[in-house]
């Protein structure tokens, strides 16, 4: 197989891999028929003129995780067949002009995780066949107009994790084939109107973790093919009424971690394909009627960790496919009895960490498929008779950390809980708060030593007498579907994010396995 440097391994199928700290220069002689060359984890600090001159058949060249800080302009001369070039995870601060000249077949160029301070239009002017350009994890502060003008075939551009403070509205104007644009983790404060107008084929736009305060009303109006829009962890305080009007293909929208105070009716939609909407960690105080009515296919709605104190009875109109509703950690004191009536397919509802004092008896009347209800850490003293009677699929009910009043009125609830103990889990049981003589005792086994007027305790209580013991619980308490970990950084369906910080604060989050955003 045409000779192989001692510090490399070569396959007979034209592949070469050179790794190790003892390598300080490109090994020679490289097999002339090499198609794939990897130079990884070495101490190479520079690439001189034409080190690959004799391997013109090369298709893939990965020079990654080295000490590379300097490249001569002619380093890649004679690599006309090269289609994939990665210089990721090195120490490059400057790219010489003309470095990629002659790489007429180049389709993928990875320059991520270096220390690049700037790029110029001349850098990529020869790369007319480029499909993928990765520039994330550098120190870029601005992108000059014209930088990408020659890359008309580009489908994926990643500029995340840089130091961009502003974007020119003209910088992407010639990228009509672009499908993925990532600008996450920069310092963008606003995005000019028209910036994305030329991106008619865009499918994913990642703008999370910037400092964007305001969205222009027509910012996305030309992006009819957009499927994934990430706007989380910015400073957005309001949404212009028409900002999401032209996004019929959108199936994922993240808005968590912003400063949204209100949501106006019709702001979302029509978005017939949207399955998940993430709005946690905002400052929303109320939900008006029909605010989500355009989202007919929505399955997950996360409104936790806001300041919601009022929900209009028709706020959830139209959400007939909703499976998961998270309202925990808000300021709710009361709920209208009809507020969940339209949610016929709801399976999980999180209402913990609010100020709920009571629940209407019909609150879950039409939500027959409920499997998990989180009501812990509220101000509940009792619950209406029969509130859970019709919920045959209920396998997780959390009632602890409420000020239960254990007088004679609690008996029907106590009896029902006694018969349905498996639903309560084993982590924490509800305990009495009053009267003082029973404070801290388990509500399930409490002995109510008071005269019980017959009016309060019917011969046949409304709570079902038949115990519900599932053979195999759908949601074992150790991995409760409504108590699993929520990620603090979104998993945005791509693998360029290198780290995801995880918090396991089960008492706060109360989210499901679907909620990884």
């Amino acid at each position: 197989y045409h000779g192989c440097p001692s510090e490399c391994t070569c396959s007979r199928a034209s592949q070469v891999e050179c790794t190790g700290a003892r390598i300080v220069a490109v090994p020679t002689p490289l097999p002339w028929n090499a198609m794939s060359l990897q130079i990884l984890n070495t101490h190479i600090t520079e690439l001189n003129e034409s080190p690959f001159l004799n391997i013109s058949a090369l298709i893939a060249l990965r020079i990654e995780k080295n000490e590379l800080s300097r490249i001569t302009p002619g380093a890649f001369r004679n690599l006309g067949s090269l289609r994939y070039l990665s210089l990721a995870n090195n120490k490059l601060q400057v790219l010489p002009i003309g470095l990629f000249q002659g790489l007429d077949s180049l389709e993928s160029l990875l320059l991520s995780s270096n220390q690049l301070l700037q790029i110029q239009p001349a850098h990529f002017s020869q790369c007319s066949n480029l499909k993928e350009l990765q520039l994330h994890g550098n120190h870029l502060e601005y992108i000059p107009d014209g930088a990408f003008d020659h890359l008309v075939g580009l489908t994926k551009l990643n500029l995340g994790k840089n130091s961009l403070t502003h974007i020119s509205p003209r910088v992407f104007q010639h990228l009509g084939n672009l499908q993925v644009l990532r600008l996450y983790e920069n310092r963008l404060t606003d995005i000019p109107m028209g910036t994305f107008d030329g991106l008619v084929n865009l499918q994913e736009l990642a703008l999370q973790q910037n400092q964007i305060g305001l969205l222009s009303p027509g910012l996305f109006h030309n992006n009819h093919n957009l499927q994934r829009l990430y706007l989380s962890n910015n400073h957005i305080s309001q949404l212009p009424p028409s900002v999401f009007m032209q996004l019929p293909q959108l199936n994922r929208l993240t808005l968590f971690g912003n400063s949204l105070k209100e949501l106006s009716p019709g702001i979302f939609g029509p978005m017939p394909n949207l399955r998940e909407l993430w709005l946690y960690d905002n400052h929303i105080s109320s939900l008006p009627d029909n605010v989500f009515s355009n989202l007919r296919q929505l399955q997950v709605l996360i409104l936790s960790r806001n300041q919601i104190s009022f929900i209009s009875p028709g706020a959830f109109n139209g959400l007939t496919e909703l499976r998961e509703l998270s309202l925990h950690t808000n300021a709710l004191q009361d709920l209208d009895g009809n507020v969940f009536r339209m949610l016929a397919n709801l399976q999980n509802i999180s209402l913990q960490n609010n100020r709920l004092r009571q629940l209407p008896g019909n609150i879950f009347a039409n939500v027959n498929g409920l499997m998990a209800i989180q009501l812990q850490n509220n101000q509940l003293e009792n619950l209406p008779l029969g509130i859970f009677d019709h919920l045959g699929k209920l396998c997780e009910l959390r009632l602890y950390d409420n000020p239960w009043r254990c007088d004679s009125d609690i008996l029907p609830l106590r009896n029902w809980l006694l018969l349905n103990q498996p639903r309560l889990g084993t982590d924490t049981v509800p305990v009495c708060f009053s009267p003082a003589n029973v404070r801290g005792q388990s509500l399930i086994i409490i002995n109510v030593n008071v005269a019980v007027p017959s009016v309060h305790v019917p011969e046949v209580p409304s709570y079902p007498e038949t115990p519900w013991y599932p053979d195999t619980p759908s949601y074992p308490d150790t991995t409760s579907v409504s108590s699993t970990t929520e990620l603090t950084s979104p998993v945005e369906d791509y693998t360029d994010l290198t780290t995801i910080q995880v918090t396991d604060d089960r008492s706060v989050w109360g989210m499901t396995q679907a909620q990884s955003g």
Partner: antibody
Framework: QVQLVQSGAEVKKPGASVEVSCKAS????????INWVRQAPGQGLEWMGW????????TYAQKFQGRVTMTRDTSTSTVYMELSSLRSEDTAVYYC?????????????WGQGTLVTVSS | DIQMTQSPSSLSASVGDRVTITCRAS??????LAWYQQKSGKAPKLLIY???SLQSGVPSRFSGSGSGTDFTLTISSLQPEDFATYYC?????????FGPGTKVDIK
């Protein structure tokens, strides 16, 4: 993201030829080789050869030399595999597969498979 | 041609079990080896390349090791979705060859 989409199932008689197509959709032609791998019912995987979609260069496994022809049409981003002089033991699912950026020969992208049945 | 053999040809295991599959090449192939998972009626899926590198998107419970002629695929804690057939493949020289497969089913 690129997908490899193959043509539909075929039923052929012994001695005939069959042509299976593999189209790159949702993106461009693979940066690497398109390989063909077959799997007889209840059996393992067998590599047949590869074609470079840009240059048209091919390498065939010795076992199929003279019976297999791999071609490509760059205008439609499609590669073709033709197998001639079919016999019953050629009944199999035929997959096209493409390598990733690390190496052309680790197949990280596969077509859905095309069942070819050879029966008299 | 380089022959690839796998053992065992089949095994029964339970969810949570640690599962090890071995692959042997008839001559040294350095680290030019891949592991694939195939479920009934589906195309194979790349799990491990270069003997030990985890393919993007594959759960970390899968790991590979070995060099030269002897290689191992390990599933640290078997999950319900892992019941499938596993193949090794040498990428060292033409023609590329696959092992005969190891079927992992439920005990």
């Amino acid at each position: 993201q690129v997908q490899l989409v193959q043509s539909g199932a075929e039923v052929k008689k012994p001695g005939a030829s069959v042509e299976v197509s593999c189209k790159a959709s949702g993106g461009t032609f693979s940066s690497y080789a398109i390989n063909w791998v077959r799997q007889a019912p209840g059996q393992g995987l067998e590599w047949m050869g590869w074609i470079d979609p840009k240059s048209g260069d091919t390498t065939y496994a010795q076992k199929f030399q003279g019976r297999v022809t791999m071609t490509r049409d760059t205008s439609t981003s499609t590669v073709y595999m033709e197998l001639s002089s079919l016999r019953s033991e050629d009944t199999a699912v035929y997959y096209c597969a493409s390598g990733g950026s690390y190496s052309p020969w680790y197949f990280d992208l596969w077509g859905q498979g095309t069942l070819v049945t050879v029966s008299s | 041609d380089i022959q690839m053999t796998q053992s065992p040809s089949s095994l029964s295991a339970s969810v949570g079990d640690r599962v090890t599959i071995t692959c042997r090449a008839s001559q040294s192939i350095s680290s030019w080896l891949a592991w694939y998972q195939q479920k009934s009626g589906k195309a194979p899926k790349l799990l491990i390349y270069a003997a030990s590198s985890l393919q993007s998107g594959v759960p970390s419970r899968f790991s590979g090791s070995g060099s030269g002629t002897d290689f191992t695929l390990t599933i640290s804690s078997l999950q319900p979705e892992d019941f499938a057939t596993y193949y090794c493949q040498q990428a060292y020289s033409f023609p590329f060859t696959f092992g005969p497969g190891t079927k992992v089913d439920i005990k």
